[in-house]
């Protein structure tokens, strides 16, 4: 089965790489614009230059193209704790990231929030914090993992998942209560 091509891909596939088919005359292949530029006017004829103009400040194109407008530069989302790693240039979008000792959590494909890496207090670091993943902690005896923090088993309620990890402690607490009833 031949995959379905969009109109634009169909038009481009008729021309050699680095060229696109003239929208008004499908016998003409025009040279695409370099990254950092956009299409101002199609080439007037075969072998003639495409009129490409440089992107204005605040916009970019990151690859060769025949776009009528440059793309708007992304803005880092301060409300999500993001910081600018590198600013937008005519041929590269803004790069956003997180501060030192933070990691990115992606809520969706194009939205991330910065959170502090867990320090594994009352536990040990099993896996170090990475760009897109929090520290993985292993808790000391008498502690269980809740929301990636090691919490004392004294905070473990019987209905919670922690009961398996804290079972000896819970039994001990029950035992002392029982012994006090004699």
């Amino acid at each position: 089965l031949v995959p379905h091509l969009g109109d634009r891909e169909k038009r481009d596939s008729v021309c050699p790489q680095g060229k696109y088919i003239h929208p008004q005359n499908n016998s003409i292949c025009c040279t695409k614009c370099h990254k950092g530029t956009y299409l101002y006017n199609d080439c007037p004829g075969p072998g003639q230059d495409t009129d490409c103009r440089e992107c204005e400040s605040g916009s970019f194109t990151a690859s060769e193209n025949h776009l009528r407008h440059c793309l708007s530069c992304s803005k880092c989302r301060k409300e999500m704790g993001q910081v600018e790693i590198s600013s937008c240039t005519v041929d590269r979008d803004t790069v956003c990231g997180c501060r030192k000792n933070q990691y990115r959590h992606y809520w969706s494909e194009n939205l991330f929030q910065c959170f502090n890496c867990s320090l594994c207090l009352n536990g040990t670091v099993h896996l170090s914090c990475q760009e897109k993943q929090n520290t993985v902690c292993t808790c000391h005896a008498g502690f269980f993992l809740r929301e990636n923090e090691c919490v004392s088993c004294s905070n473990c309620k019987k209905s919670l998942e922690c009961t398996k990890l804290c079972l000896p402690q819970i039994e001990n607490v029950k035992g002392t209560e029982d012994s006090g009833t004699t």
Epitope: K78, E79, Q113, F115, N116, N134, E147, N148
Partner: nanobody
Framework: EVQLLESGGGLVQPGGSLRLSCAAS????????MVWVRQAPGKGLEWVSH????????YYADSVEGRFTISRDNSKNTLYLQMNSLRAEDTAVYYC????????????WGQGTLVTVSS
């Protein structure tokens, strides 16, 4: 005690509009970024939109961009979601939430309001 109470959901025809509200109490509303998320039947949570503390910066998922508008009234401690040109795929339970601070989970969110888009 933090409380978030959504309202405004209901049954609407494709192409129709609804305005969701979220009444907040128990915390300083103006100090928090607020979020709308939704859960379609049998699916996971989807981030719909969020708005910064002063209502200046907003974000929309690609699926709702140009159709939904988030806003807030800090004097009324209320968050809104204006939903226009509704589609069948917008059918979901809509929740308002406070943007998490400690980690990627929601400490505070409402009970949700059901939006059904059907002819």
């Amino acid at each position: 005690e933090v409380q978030l109470l959504e309202s405004g959901g209901g049954l609407v025809q494709p192409g129709g509009s609804l305005r969701l509200s979220c009444a907040a109490s128990g915390f300083t509303f103006a100090h928090d970024v607020m979020v709308w998320v939704r859960q379609a039947p049998g699916k996971g949570l989807e981030w719909v939109s969020h708005i910064d503390r002063v209502g200046q910066d907003t974000y929309y998922a690609d699926s709702v961009e140009g159709r939904f508008t988030i806003s807030r009234d800090n004097s009324k401690n209320t968050l809104y979601l204006q939903m226009n040109s509704l589609r069948a795929e917008d059918t979901a339970v809509y929740y308002c939430a406070v943007l998490p601070k400690r980690g990627p989970w929601f400490d505070y969110w409402g009970q949700g309001t059901l939006v059904t888009v059907s002819s």
